[in-house]
Amino acid sequence: LIQERRSHEVNPAAHLTGANSSLTGSGGPLLWETQLGLAFLRGLSYHDGALVVTKAGYYYIYSKVQLGGVGCPLGLASTITHGLYKRTPRYPEELELLVSQQSPCGRATSSSRVWWDSSFLGGVVHLEAGEKVVVRVLDERLVRLRDGTRSYFGAFMV
Amino acid sequence: LIQERRSHEVNPAAHLTGANSSLTGSGGPLLWETQLGLAFLRGLSYHDGALVVTKAGYYYIYSKVQLGGVGCPLGLASTITHGLYKRTPRYPEELELLVSQQSPCGRATSSSRVWWDSSFLGGVVHLEAGEKVVVRVLDERLVRLRDGTRSYFGAFMV
Amino acid sequence: LIQERRSHEVNPAAHLTGANSSLTGSGGPLLWETQLGLAFLRGLSYHDGALVVTKAGYYYIYSKVQLGGVGCPLGLASTITHGLYKRTPRYPEELELLVSQQSPCGRATSSSRVWWDSSFLGGVVHLEAGEKVVVRVLDERLVRLRDGTRSYFGAFMV
C-alpha cells in the first residue's frame, strides 16, 4: 500500500465536536458538530456520526470523551467502554479499531459523589475510500458534552 | 482554507517539556523548556508559555500532564481541569480548544496515600499566524514537572 | 535539523498491536504484532518489541495500554508506570521519552472489585536512523491485551 503526499495537495483532516444532539439514546454512535466553532471537515465527509473517507490511506484517528456523573447508580455500568469503530461496505458488522475501558465510578467516594474522568484514544489505521469511522461510548449517559472542547472526534492523513 | 504541503518545505513542529520553572503560581499558563533535552521548536516560536504560530494552518496540538499528590488535603471533591487555550489578537479573552476534567483524588485509598494520574489532550485546530496556544492546569500544584517526560506540550502541522 | 517531505515519497508510519505474546515476564519491553489485523509497518522496521527507525526525522510516537485487575493484591505495585523509551547505539542505557504514572487501584470499589483503566501517551521526538523505541509497563501483569485494539504502539513522521 504505497501512499504518497504529492505537493500542492490538500491533506485530509477533520475535527468534530460534541454538541447537545450528540447523545441519541438510540444505541447508535455519537453524533457530532461538523461546522460551528472549532469543528471542520477538509477532504473528509460526514454522515450520521461517521467520518467518511474520500481518499484511501493511513489516518491518525482520535477521540476524547469527557465522562462525569453524580455517584454511580446501579443502573449504570461500572465499566465504560469508549471506542473508534470502522464500517466498511465489505463487511456487515462494525470493526473495533481503538478501544478503552475505564472504571470511573471508583472516583466517586462517600464524601464526594460528583466525579469526572476523561478517555483519549488515538492511533493510525488504514482506511479505504468510502469506509466510515464512528465513536461509541457505553454507557453514553455518562458522556458530558457542554461546549465542544471536552468531547470530540477527529482524523488526519499521515 | 486550502492548506498545501509543498515539497522541500519544513513542516512546523514543536515539543516542549516540563521544568522546575514551569509552575509560576501567578495564575498564568504553565511555562515550558524549549531547548534542553527532548524539547525543540521547528517553524514555531515560544513566548511566556505559549507556542506561537508562524505559518497559518491546521495543527495537531497536544499536551500531557502528570498529576500527583499525597492523599487529598483539598477534599475528594477537588476537580482538576487541564486545557489547551488559544490567544488571538482578534479577541480579548482566551478561547478553550481542548479541555479535560478529572477527579484524581478518588485514586487515593487507605492502602495507598500517594496517587498518580495522567491527563492527555490532543486534537486538530486551525491556527492563524501570530496566534498563541497555552496550557493551563487548575490546580497547577498537582502537576509533576520535574523531569520533562511526564508533562509536556507540543504541536505539528497536519 | 532540517527535515523535508519530498513529493512521491512514502511517509514512515507504523501501528503495532497487543497480542498474547506481548507480555514476556522477562523484564524486557512489551512485544507487538506487526502484520496481522490492524498492525502494519511502513518505512519503519521492528525488532524484539522495538520500532526501528530507517529514516531520521521528527516522529509522533504513541502508545496506549489497557490496564485492568481484580482488586489490588499487595504483591502488585500501587503505581503503574507506562513509558516510551529510546535505545540508541550512542548510549548504553534506555532514555525516557514519554512517561505516565497512574494509580488505578483506587478505581476498585467495595461494590465492584474489578477495575479498568487506560493510559495514553503521545508526543513528537527526534529519532536518528538505527535508533529504537520500546514500550514498557511496570507492573506489566496489569496490562490487558485481548484483541489488539486496547493496547497498541505506533509512530509516524511529522
Epitope: - | 488535603p73 500517594v114 502537576v143 | -
Partner: antibody, heavy 121, light 107 residues
Framework: QVQLQESGPGLVKPSGTLSLTCAVS?????????WNWVRQPPGKGLEWIGE???????NYNPSLKSRVTMSVDKAKNQFSLKLNSVTAADTAVYYC??????????????WGQGTTVTVSS | AIQLTQSPSSLSASVGDRVTITCRAS??????LAWFQQKPGKPPKLLIF???DLESGVSSRFSGSGSGTDFTLTISSLQPGDFATYYC?????????FGQGTRLEIK
C-alpha cells in the same frame, strides 16, 4: 519560609486531656499540605499520631484513633491536637510537622522544635 | 500497618568513610519513602523524599535508592556533622510509619 511552633502545657495529669497547638508562620495553612503531629517517647523512635488538612480532613493512627482529635483554625493560621485519657505511656516530645502533598515534592520538610509533655500526677 | 526494619541498628564509622543504611518494608510501598536525620534535642531533618530525591539544601553526599520493599541511604564521605540517628519513613499507606532508627557513632 514556613516555620512551626508548638505550644501547650508541659504537664498533664493521668486520665486528663493533652492539648497542643502549632502556629504556622511565614506561609498559609490553606495550601496543599498535611499538617502532622509526631511524637517521640524518651530514648525511643518516632510515632506518627495523625494529620489534618486546611479543609478539616483528618487521618489518625489507628492505635490512637479513639483518643485523638485534630482541628485547624484558618483564621489564626494554626492547628491543634487533643489526646484524651492520657497515661504515662503518652509522655513524649510532641512535634508538629508540615508534609507537602503536591505532585513534585513530598515529605515532612518543616518541623517544629518540639514540646515535651509529661504525664504525671 | 506497614513495618519498616532498619539495619544496622547502630554502627561506628570514621570521618571520610562511606556508609550505607538499609530499610526494608513489610510490603511494597513503591517509592513512597523518606529518610530523616535527627540529632539529640532537635527535630528530625528531611534528607531524601520519594526514595531517591535529595531535599533542597541537603548535601549531595547523601543519596537514596530503592523501590518496592528494599531501600538504602548512602553517605558517600562522612563528615563530623553526620553523626546522628537516621530514620526511614513510609508515607505510602495509613498509618504513616517510621523505622526504629539507626544510630551512627564516631569510631
Amino acid at each position: 519560609q514556613v516555620q512551626l511552633q508548638e505550644s501547650g502545657p508541659g504537664l498533664v495529669k493521668p486520665s486528663g486531656t493533652l492539648s497542643l497547638t502549632c502556629a504556622v508562620s511565614g506561609g498559609s495553612i490553606s495550601s496543599i499540605n498535611w499538617w502532622n503531629w509526631v511524637r517521640q517517647p524518651p530514648g525511643k523512635g518516632l510515632e506518627w499520631i495523625g494529620e489534618v488538612s486546611h479543609s478539616g480532613i483528618t487521618n489518625y493512627n489507628p492505635s490512637l484513633k479513639s483518643r485523638v482529635t485534630m482541628s485547624v483554625d484558618k483564621a489564626k493560621n494554626q492547628f491543634s491536637l487533643k489526646l484524651n485519657s492520657v497515661t504515662a505511656a503518652d509522655t513524649a516530645v510532641y512535634y508538629c510537622a508540615r508534609e507537602r502533598a503536591v505532585a513534585d515534592y513530598h515529605g515532612m520538610d518543616v518541623w517544629g522544635q518540639g514540646t515535651t509533655v509529661t504525664v504525671s500526677s | 500497618a506497614i513495618q519498616l526494619t532498619q539495619s544496622p541498628s547502630s554502627l561506628s564509622a570514621s570521618v571520610g568513610d562511606r556508609v550505607t543504611i538499609t530499610c526494608r518494608a513489610s510490603q511494597g510501598i513503591s517509592s513512597a519513602l523518606a529518610w530523616f536525620q535527627q540529632k539529640p534535642g532537635k527535630p528530625p531533618k528531611l534528607l531524601i523524599f520519594d526514595a531517591s530525591d535529595l531535599e533542597s539544601g541537603v548535601s549531595s553526599r547523601f543519596s537514596g535508592s530503592g523501590s518496592g520493599t528494599d531501600f538504602t541511604l548512602t553517605i558517600s564521605s562522612l563528615q563530623p556533622g553526620d553523626f546522628a540517628t537516621y530514620y526511614c519513613q513510609q508515607f505510602n499507606s495509613y498509618p504513616i510509619t517510621f523505622g526504629q532508627g539507626t544510630r551512627l557513632e564516631i569510631k
